[in-house]
Interface confidence: medium
């Protein structure tokens, strides 16, 4: 029985040029995290592995920082950066977890940038 | 050339025994996850188990969590698939499998099989 | 446990035609799905991964599309050598599991 809830950053707003940092968590549940995978869309951008450590797509190479934690730091945000962002937690025995993060990025440089947390 | 290469099957009774290997070239086994799969004399393919990259997780299928135990020999860049209690309905020929990235990916390189036949 | 549910069990094409395979799963697993094309004989060998991505040295008359629970491979002009069976897996949540496999054959 799944009885992890995921708590994410929300939705979030950032500067073109800047960096923005996404974060999930999963809490309420013993299972075992075996691998975070973080999607744009449909589009998959990096992977935190438990035993492998971190994947980062080849595309997204230049721009895509692993961590802190398990987070994925975004650089060099541009307005096409803007769309749903996903934690998807594979866990053992729970199974998958799936968060979703809106981002916006802005022209204006009176972006504020959504609330952050870490991992302990 | 990246090759996996399975041995060890074989003609096995009802509640026997039998472990079958993969022998792994071309690539470091320990840099990768690892699957077995399996499949029935003209049935589909069924997947049976997986091995994280640092050998620390592992992941089975329902039909044979607590017979079977897979498990990899670095210095022999070898991955084992312990088979106990064996029924009927494990005859199939095994494969095993290289993970492409992480353990929730695509099984990208294949060995060509061996046949296990469990029958009194 | 996703169940993976293929269509059709199998099919009768000639060289040439356009083939649509399609496959169903239970639940969403978002882009988590990959094909497999199989000979008799033969082990299994992936054709594309994430549902879309075509692995290296696999020709382009193959294509996958497809998000969430419906999928589709599609073969733009089936030549000889891919009459064969061809299974979709997910990879979204373990156990990873398989469709039951749409064998084309020569009509």
């Known amino acids: 029985m799944m009885t992890g809830t995921i708590e994410t950053t929300g939705n979030i707003s950032a500067e073109k040029g800047g960096s923005i940092i996404l974060q999930c968590h999963l809490s309420s549940t013993t299972a075992q995290v075996t691998q975070v995978n973080w999607e744009q869309q449909d589009q998959l951008l990096a992977i935190c592995n438990a035993d492998l450590g971190w994947h980062i797509s080849p595309s997204f190479k230049d721009r895509v920082a692993p961590g802190p934690g398990l987070g994925l730091t975004l650089q060099s945000l541009t307005v096409n950066d803007t769309g749903e962002y996903f934690c998807i937690y594979h866990t053992y025995p729970d199974g998958t977890y799936t968060g979703r993060i809106f981002l916006e990025v802005l022209e204006s440089s009176v972006a504020e940038h959504g609330a952050r947390f870490q991992i302990p | 050339e990246v090759q996996l290469l399975e041995s060890g099957g074989g003609l096995v009774q009802p509640g026997g025994s039998l472990r079958l290997s993969c022998a792994a070239s071309?690539?470091?086994?320990?840099?990768?996850?690892m699957a077995w799969v399996r499949q029935a004399p003209g049935k589909g393919l069924e997947w049976v188990s997986t091995l994280s990259g640092s050998g620390g997780s592992t992941y089975y299928a329902d039909s044979v969590k607590g017979r079977f135990t897979i498990s990899r020999d670095n210095s022999k860049n070898t991955l084992y698939l312990q088979m106990n209690s064996l029924r009927a309905e494990d005859t199939a020929v095994y494969y095993c499998?290289?993970?492409?990235?992480?353990?929730?990916?695509?099984?990208?390189?294949w060995g060509q099989g061996t046949l296990v036949t469990v029958s009194s | 446990d996703i169940q993976m549910t293929q269509s059709p069990y199998s099919l009768s094409a000639s060289v040439g035609d356009r083939v649509t395979i399609t496959c169903r799963a239970s639940q969403s697993i978002r882009r988590y799905l990959n094909w497999y094309q199989q000979k008799p004989g033969k082990a299994p060998k992936l054709l594309i991964y994430?549902?879309?991505t075509l692995q290296t040295g696999v020709p382009s008359r193959f294509s996958g599309s497809g998000s969430g629970t419906d999928f589709t491979l599609t073969i733009s002009s089936l030549q000889p050598e891919d009459f064969a069976t061809y299974y979709c897996?997910?990879?979204?949540?373990?156990?990873?599991?398989f469709g039951g496999g749409t064998k084309v054959e020569i009509k």
């Open positions: 071309g690539f470091t086994l320990s840099s990768y996850a």
């Open positions: 994430r549902a879309s």
């Open positions: 499998a290289r993970v492409r990235v992480g353990a929730y990916d695509a099984f990208d390189i």
């Open positions: 897996q997910q990879t979204y949540s373990s156990p990873f599991t």
